[in-house]
């Protein structure tokens, strides 16, 4: 039931809950409302999920096909140095901080742009697909 | 179209208080860091404050630090300025001023102005 | 704190010159650099940031460049509504500072 950590490399699953897209082996969850990165981050985490962790540039580039202009929240920060939520360091893309508040990264379809964490924005989660859709 | 509209500039006594006001129009107000930059007659630009989204997170000048106040109120989408213990140093033009946006610091718009007169 | 320093304070030039103003930081603050202009009694108007980057409007004889602690902005050809005064400003940290200004008139 792809069991243990959220950052995990999931099994082949058979499914995502409802308003989920499964891509590859995992289960991504784009929002339609706009939170900050913090309450994005809890959104993600109270649906056992995490906020988007990629992984390399290929999925970066399938996930921007499903993007627009609009920048979306991603498991991204800037604590001396950019890393993503599972503690692995940003290290296949560029990304650049503007003013002391950028601290926050988000993604659209052109590529990862960094943020003050307090913009509301769209985000998008990733979690392992479940085998029973009730258990969501 | 954006719009920043100061108001409550005036002449002040050395060691009175004034409030300046940044009425903002034109796009969302609560997605923006502000800023409160003057300029004193025939003088440069020399920014003062500027407040983060929510209000939480305010940054001064060392100029105004413990003298100023930013505040906002995001429901009345309006910026604010109490100044108190003024001096004549403080004479000068106040603009309001909006970020680019996503808390790039630089400053995008800029109101016309209400010029603080501080004089016995 | 970091400080901003412009030169000319003021330069003398016709319609259609190629100017160039510059703007040196105490220490190095990469491309954390926006440009603005003023004219007499109005608010000033965002013309760069990020050195180089021309803000949305403006015309692009306007040009930034520069990183570390030395820029310019460079003004192709002249024109008469161009003349005005000209600051720097230092975007990515507390105090934001700005240069002091390079008045712009015509010779």
């Known amino acids: 039931l792809c069991q243990g950590s959220n950052y995990s490399t999931c099994a082949s699953c058979p499914s995502c809950p409802d308003r989920w897209m499964k891509y590859g082996n995992h289960c991504y969850y784009f929002s339609v409302e706009e939170k900050d990165w913090n309450s994005s981050l809890e959104f993600c985490l109270a649906r056992d999920s995490h906020l988007l962790v990629i992984t390399d540039n290929q999925e970066m580039s399938l996930l921007q096909v499903f993007l627009s202009e609009a920048f979306c929240w991603i498991g991204l920060r800037n604590n001396s140095g950019w890393r993503w939520e599972d503690g692995s360091p940003l290290n296949f893309s560029r990304i650049s901080s503007n003013s002391f508040v950028q601290t926050c990264g988000a993604i659209n379809k052109n590529g990862l742009q960094a943020s003050s964490c307090e913009v509301p924005l769209h985000w998008v989660c990733k979690k392992c697909p479940f085998a029973d859709q009730a258990l969501f | 179209e954006v719009q920043l509209v100061e108001s409550g500039g005036g002449l002040v006594k050395p060691g009175g208080s004034l409030r300046l006001s940044c009425a903002a129009s034109?796009?969302?107000?609560?997605?923006?860091?502000m800023s409160w930059v003057r300029q004193a007659p025939g003088k440069g630009l020399e920014w003062v404050a500027t407040i983060s989204i929510s209000g939480g997170q305010t940054y001064y000048a060392d100029s105004v630090k413990g003298r100023f106040t930013i505040s906002r109120d995001n429901a009345k989408n309006t910026l604010y300025l109490q100044m108190s213990s003024l001096r004549a140093e403080d004479t000068a033009v106040y603009y309001c001023?909006?970020?680019?946006?996503?808390?790039?610091?630089?400053?995008?718009?800029w109101g016309q102005g209400t010029l603080v007169t501080v004089s016995s | 704190d970091i400080q901003m320093t412009q030169s000319p304070s003021s330069l003398s030039a016709s319609v259609g010159d190629r100017v160039t103003i510059t703007c040196r930081a105490s220490e190095n603050i990469y491309s954390a650099l926006a440009w603005y202009q003023q004219k007499p009694g109005k608010a000033p108007k965002f013309l760069i940031h990020?050195?180089?980057t021309l803000a949305e409007g403006v015309p692009s004889r306007f040009s930034g460049s520069g990183s570390g602690t030395d820029f310019t902005l460079t003004i192709s050809s002249l024109q008469p509504e161009d003349f005005a005064t000209y600051y720097c400003?230092?975007?990515?940290?507390?105090?934001?500072?700005f240069g002091q200004g390079t008045k712009l008139e015509i010779k």
């Open positions: 034109g796009f969302t107000f609560s997605r923006y860091y």
């Open positions: 001023a909006r970020e680019g946006g996503y808390g790039n610091l630089w400053f995008a718009y």
């Open positions: 400003q230092y975007h990515y940290g507390i105090p934001f500072t």
């Open positions: 990020n050195a180089k």
